[in-house]
């Protein structure tokens, strides 16, 4: 119906458009202003959600068209606004007006089950009328339009066990079901709209109904009799065999427990395999064929969980008979004890009896034994099982011995048993005490009488029942050493005191003091020990801490100035050597282009003061140093080793300083004049030409620090191949050609 609105001048209506129209555009209605006289002066405008996309207006006539297929279920109402505009001015002729486009419903949606999949579980044997599940279908159509969304439910599949309430969708049981016959049911429910009238749309759903188990079956043994055998050697816990009972129920309702009956000695037990529900008969105690060779027992099975109301189904539990035959075995020897602890004092002569072990054959034939001993060569065993010593034992070497005695049957050597034998060696006082450490003792030249020079202590390798106690004495034989005196502190330490004021380093650089140390053992043992005391120039401070560093050089007779000079020389030599090395490495061109040299370079690091033998395994130094133009020399490496070994001896022995100084100076002179001696601790790179060269070595290693020159003029006579060498190493003045 057209509506005339006198205030606004609009002629319009509330528009309806059916959903799902298949035409490209569908005419809905017309907006018209009664001010429009058709004089091409008005323009109609459509505004709001859907304007210009879902709905289009003919701006000339006001005709509204739907240009898209509408779906009421997606959107059922459109609120739009209309304007009428004067084309000449571009202004609205009247106020904007709101109107409604309603999408009318058609029955285009079938009922749908939104909660799929439907799955229900109901106990087996449930009575008729038991609630199973409720299914609900939804219809997207308009419930206020006819019966578009009025649904009825119908059971398509599932009779005679189930039924559905037509209006609610509630599924109920209509007859009892046994899970052991069938455990799953597939029910199909149909939902129809329009109350099932012609033209109705329908949808279906499948309901999977599982029957849950109730414990309405008892377990029953598959067999009424089982026969098993067991070896008498089988250990406790051995599985003898499996028995099996079946229960038609599942899960917890099929869980069963087996029990043993008629087994007074409690030798057997049954455990259950939770995966297979089998009963495993196991050995609870050891069996002995010699004692009993046959056992007859009965096993019973019952469910673990039985509800009270289902108890009648479980009366008269199923039983089975089990016969166990014990098999005889040749058993290994058995020691009387699992292990033995024997004791013996140290120092006993070999052949001393330590103790006896014994093993027997448990079988009826009682085979004789043969014994073997392993674990130490200090012991032996005879056929009676008696263990004797084969050496004198020293507790300080080993206080315990862990031996293994093996017994074998003489009738069957394969039958072996072993036992551990622990031998404890008792202590006797057979070790004298000694200094607890090496003492590097110094006394200052300006020491005063009564000044503490050293505190000494002792150790004893013997074991003491009570604590060790040591007694210190100055040897009476040591008559020349009245310069020092010893005082026993009665606490296992003693103090060495200066017995005079002032010492002279040059006249008497070293003193040797003989000290006797006795222990409190029975019998008591005494040792003689020598303490070396070195005289040191401590300066005014009278502090001996720096003596250890200065000792050697001062003994040699060097003063501070000499030490500084030696250090500077060493640094200069090092600097010079590294400069040469750097220059050599920077040089790209080879010295002799005609023949490439074969260099073998070896770097050796000696972290110890002695040794140096490793280099002889890498290359032959003598071979490298050999030259027809040089006098034979001892290899420098061995010389330096000699010097080092003498240095080490000097710390311990301390020979006459003048002799030592003379020796060092000789060695320094020899090293200085040696043309093939590199600086000490330097990196040595040997360019070895090989034997047979009449020129000997041309290496820079062969150079000297003296003015002596080698004559290489003979290189001129070796022909054109040596022309370049001759020019480099020959005499400076060349003969005129």
């Amino acid at each position: 119906d057209y509506k005339d609105d006198d205030d606004k001048g609009w002629v319009w209506n509330q528009f309806f458009v059916p959903e799902e129209m298949n035409t490209t555009s569908h005419h809905i209605g017309q907006l018209r202003s009664d001010l429009d006289n058709g004089n091409n002066s008005f323009q109609y405008k459509l505004l709001g959600a859907g304007a210009g996309s879902t709905f289009i207006i003919d701006e000339r006539t006001g005709d509204i068209y739907a240009i898209q297929k509408l779906d009421r279920e997606e959107r059922s109402l459109y609120i739009l606004r209309a304007q009428v505009i004067d084309i000449a001015t571009g202004r609205a002729v009247e106020p904007e007006s709101e109107f409604v486009i309603k999408v009318s419903d058609i029955n285009d949606n079938e009922p749908r089950f939104l909660d799929e999949p439907y799955e229900a579980i109901v106990p087996e044997m449930s009575p008729e009328g038991t609630f199973v599940i409720k299914v609900t279908a939804n219809d997207a159509d308009d419930p206020s339009t006819g019966y578009h969304a009025r649904i009825l439910y119908n059971l398509e599949r599932g009779q005679p066990y189930f039924s559905v309430e037509p209006t609610t969708g509630v599924i109920r049981i209509s007859s009892k079901m046994d899970r052991e016959l069938q455990d799953t049911y597939c029910v199909i429910i149909q939902a129809k709209d329009m109350l099932g009238q012609p033209g109705a749309l329908s949808g279906t759903t499948t309901v999977s109904i599982k029957l849950s188990d109730i414990n309405d079956n008892k377990p029953i043994f598959k067999e009424s009799f089982y026969r098993f055998t067991i070896s008498e050697s089988a250990p406790i816990g051995t599985s003898i065999g499996k028995i099996m009972a079946y229960d038609d129920d599942i899960g917890e309702n099929a869980e069963m427990e087996y029990s043993i009956e008629d087994d007074d000695s409690k030798i057997f037990d049954i455990i259950i395999d939770n995966d297979t529900q089998e009963g495993i008969v196991i050995l609870k105690k050891k069996v002995d064929f010699e004692q009993q060779s046959y056992y007859g027992i009965r096993a019973k099975v019952k469910n673990c969980h039985v509800d009270e109301e289902l108890a009648p189904a479980h009366v008269n539990a199923s039983t089975t008979y089990i016969k166990v035959q014990v098999e005889d075995e040749d058993e290994p020897p058995v020691f009387l004890l699992p292990y033995y602890i024997l004791e013996i004092p140290e120092g006993k002569p070999y052949g001393t009896i330590v103790g006896t072990v014994s093993a027997t054959d448990p079988d009826r034939r009682q085979s004789p034994m043969r014994y073997y001993l392993t674990g130490s060569k200090m012991f032996d065993i005879n056929d009676n099982g008696t263990i004797i010593t084969t050496n004198m034992l020293d507790r300080e070497v080993s206080a315990w011995y862990n031996l293994t005695v093996t017994a074998t049957e003489t009738y069957n050597v394969q039958q072996i048993s072993s036992a551990h034998v622990y031998v404890q060696v008792f202590n006797i006082n057979d070790n004298a005490p000694e200094f607890s450490q090496f003492y590097e003792t110094y006394v200052c030249e300006n020491a005063e009488s009564g000044e503490i020079v050293q505190i000494i202590s002792a150790i004893d390798r013997d074991e003491s029942i009570e604590d060790h106690h040591f007694y210190f004495n100055h040897s009476l034989e040591d008559t020349n050493n009245s310069s020092f005196m010893l005082t026993d502190n009665q606490d296992n330490t003693a103090v060495i005191l200066s017995n005079r004021t002032g010492f002279n380093l040059k006249e008497e650089p070293v003193f040797y003091m003989i000290i006797l140390i006795a222990d409190n053992g029975i019998p008591s043992l005494t040792s003689t020990n020598t303490l070396t005391i070195q005289v040191c120039d401590c300066g005014d401070s009278r502090n001996t801490e720096t003596c250890a560093n200065k000792g050697l050089l001062f003994i040699m007779g060097f003063r501070t100035e000499a030490i500084i000079a030696i250090m500077i020389c060493v640094m200069v030599i090092f600097g010079f050597f590294f400069l040469i090395l750097a220059l050599k490495q920077r040089r790209k061109e080879t010295l002799f282009p005609e023949k490439t040299e074969d260099f073998r370079e070896n770097i050796f690091c000696y972290d110890d003061e002695g040794g140096g033998e490793e280099d002889s395994e890498a290359f032959d130094i003598v071979e490298l140093r050999q030259s027809t133009v040089m006098r034979e020399r001892k290899p420098q490496r061995s010389k330096s080793a000699e010097i080092r070994s003498l240095y080490r001896q000097s710390l311990q022995v301390g020979p006459d300083s003048a002799i030592f100084r003379k020796f060092i100076l000789e060695k320094l002179e020899e090293a200085n004049t040696d043309p093939c001696a590199p600086p000490f601790d330097s990196l040595q790179t040997f360019a070895y030409e090989g034997t047979g060269s009449s020129a000997g070595s041309l290496s820079s290693l062969a150079s000297r620090d003296t003015d002596q020159e080698d004559d290489f003029d003979y290189l001129n006579d070796l022909g054109p191949r040596f022309k370049r060498l001759a020019s480099m190493f020959g005499s400076a003045v060349q003969p005129n050609n």
Epitope: G38, N39, N40, S41, Y44, D58, R60, Y65, I87
Partner: antibody
Amino acid sequence: QVQLQESGPGLVKPSETLSLTCTVSGGSINSYYWSWIRQPPGKGLEWIGYIYYIGSTNYNPSLKSRVTISVDTSKNQFSLKLSSVTAADTALYYCARDSRYRSGWYDAFDIWGQGTMVTVSS
Amino acid sequence: DIVLTQSPGTLSLSPGERATLSCRASQSVAGSYLAWYQQKPGQAPRLLISGASSRATGIPDRFSGSGSGTDFTLTISRLEPEDFAVYYCQQYGKSPITFGQGTRLEMK
């Protein structure tokens, strides 16, 4: 640029329906108004009616009872059907486009087809 | 319906001359919604002027339109040989759209 091409039978029997199609090329049929105009031999021009792409139509009252104009946006075409034709309907039929895009009212015809001659004769 | 009357029916002029074509409406044309077209033999009409005075795209400036209400004029300031054709006026101010009967411009 937009071009128009009329097509249809050149001869129609009296009392039958004249059917013509105008194909729009070089542009979209959407958002413009499309008209049919005819010109009898040796005479002036006569406006038949228009269609908007959404299907909205307006016809000349003198022909309204016999005229149907339709649109097929998917093919970019619009059509004319004139029923119960007589010899007076013999003319050169043109399709044309209003020059104003989505205009509020009518406008001059800025693009024309070449025209197709339809003769009504038995 | 608005009836449009064009005058003269035929106009004979020489190239270079000025041509004045008249169009009279039976009632006032709203918003000056009047257009002029040129049609040559065997061709479709061609839009010259819309809105009584606005030249269409590509139309030479020797063509001009004027008038309002009921009286409208098309003027060709200096005739060119290609300008000799039939000229129609059209109103689109009120439905239905109507055309004049046409003025034939011929070469003298």
